[in-house]
């Protein structure tokens, strides 16, 4: 058989943030190429990244069709220059990925504070509603559109002059917090899906502080 020099892929790993989803694997190919297939539990296999020498394959276009489905991928190994060759069982070597359910497992990307506005002793903080690659009716959905109320944001805020942090939570992308007049505050937000078992929280957003350009102040 012509497959004696091919090795099966291993360490198949899903890397996914805000539904941008890439399958990675090892090893770096030596005299071999790879093709990836993806399927839902009940669906047909679809081939992607044909005869590639890469060790990753972007599967975003497939998983965004239904982010609540569970997907399985497999990576086939072929001898370079002889991709028709099969193994002793009559098919090329392949390795299965772990199952992957995007809605439950995609990492939440680092959020961004879009703006904050002070009116007297209240500050309205708005979190940017990041666009995903999930589509509905030919438009790209935002993170909020996809997750709905499953997604909350936690706001951490503190006086610039001290380190004691306070928190607030919201099911929208807005906060309205009480502040002391004449004090400057700093803010950071985190995206959270409390109902998840894994990947429940994003990293914290960059810190934004009052007195810098992003904010706005009104008496």
């Amino acid at each position: 058989s012509g497959t004696t020099n091919t090795v099966a892929a291993y360490n198949l790993t899903w890397k996914s943030t805000n539904f941008k989803t890439i399958l990675e694997w090892e090893p770096k190919p030596v005299n071999q190429v790879y093709t990836v297939q993806i399927s839902t539990k009940s669906g047909d296999w679809k081939s992607k990244c044909f005869y590639t020498t890469d060790t990753e394959c972007d599967l975003t276009d497939e998983i965004v069709k239904d982010v609540k489905q569970t997907y399985l991928a497999r990576v086939f190994s072929y001898p370079a220059g002889n991709v028709e060759s099969t193994g002793s069982a009559g098919e090329p070597l392949y390795e299965n990925s772990p199952e992957f359910t995007p809605y439950l497992e995609t990492n939440l990307g680092q959020p961004t504070i879009q703006s904050f506005e002070q009116v007297g002793t209240k500050v309205n903080v708005t979190v940017e509603d990041e666009r995903t690659l999930v589509r509905r009716n030919n438009t790209f959905l935002s993170l909020r559109d996809v997750f709905g109320k499953d997604l909350i944001y936690t706001l951490y805020y503190w006086k610039s002059s001290s380190s004691g942090k306070k928190t607030a939570k919201t099911h929208t992308n807005e906060f309205l917090i009480d502040v002391d007049k004449g004090e400057n505050y700093c803010f950071s937000v985190q995206a959270v899906i409390p109902s998840r078992k894994v990947n429940r929280k994003s990293t914290d957003s960059p810190v934004e502080c009052m007195g810098q350009e992003k904010g706005e102040f009104r008496e």
């Epitope: 509905r136 996809v146 709905g148 939570k169 919201t170 929208t172």
Partner: antibody, heavy 125, light 108 residues
Framework: QVQLQESGPGLVKPSQTLSLTCTVS?????????WSWIRQHPGKGLEWIGE???????RYNPSLKSRVTISVDTSKNQFSLKLSSVTAADTAVYYC??????????????????WGKGTTVTVSS | EIVLTQSPGTLSLSPGERATLSCRAS???????LAWYQQKPGQAPRLLIY???TRQTGIPDRFSGSGSGTDFTLTISRLEPEDFAVYYC?????????FGGGTKVEIK
């Protein structure tokens, strides 16, 4: 002033699919609220069935999930409930409701603040 | 699921009296997600209290809510004739959202 109106057949045969529509008037279904279905069995308490966002994002009661589909039609300002394989135990008053954000404790949380009048559905042959 | 148990099942009182309704959760509920509804015969429920203690717009101040964790209370300080109805507590923090079994406040 947002108003909700349920519509659909009042009588459904066992094993068939119950289909109800809720029409939203006085406001847009795409304006950042969620839209829910709740039912009340005769002389009993309230049971949450599920909810939908204008984007199509849904949450369902796990006890009904295998039989329930909630969908939204933004062009008609309507959302709908389908409950399959019904039995006499699905006889109830079905309400649609708006789940709107209210300010509380520095953030915004959702509560069912506007309800339809309810429609009685009887499952019987 | 979170089970909400309301007590008493029925409360028989006269107009002008104080009504105290209890709602106990099977596990801790973030007060941000606790609401109270009023339902009269043949009508849909009406939101009275959200966030355990905040009155909905237009709700008279004789209605007040309190509590945290697993124990919540709705108090009607002086019952008016229009207050005789069934009251439900609800949690909207954990799917499935659940309602208590209701407390009927009836005229003695």
């Amino acid at each position: 002033q947002v108003q909700l109106q349920e519509s659909g057949p009042g009588l459904v045969k066992p094993s068939q699919t119950l289909s109800l529509t809720c029409t939203v008037s006085g406001g847009s279904i795409s304006s950042g609220q969620y839209w829910s279905w709740i039912r009340q069995h005769p002389g009993k308490g309230l049971e949450w069935i599920g909810e939908i966002y204008y984007s199509g994002s849904t949450r369902y009661n796990p006890s009904l999930k295998s039989r329930v589909t909630i969908s939204v039609d933004t062009s008609k300002n309507q959302f709908s409930l389908k409950l399959s394989s019904v039995t006499a135990a699905d006889t109830a008053v079905y309400y649609c409701a708006r789940d709107a954000p209210y300010y509380y404790g520095g953030g915004y949380y959702y509560y069912m603040d506007v309800w339809g009048k309810g429609t009685t559905v009887t499952v019987s042959s | 699921e979170i089970v909400l148990t309301q007590s008493p099942g029925t409360l028989s009182l006269s107009p002008g009296e104080r009504a105290t309704l209890s709602c106990r959760a099977s596990e801790s509920v973030d007060s941000s997600y606790l609401a109270w509804y009023q339902q009269k015969p043949g009508q849909a429920p009406r939101l009275l209290i959200y966030g355990a203690s905040t009155r909905q717009t237009g709700i008279p101040d004789r209605f007040s809510g309190s509590g945290s964790g697993t124990d919540f209370t709705l108090t009607i300080s002086r019952l008016e004739p229009e207050d005789f109805a069934v009251y439900y507590c609800q949690q909207a923090g954990v799917v499935p959202y659940t309602f208590g079994g209701g407390t009927k406040v009836e005229i003695k």
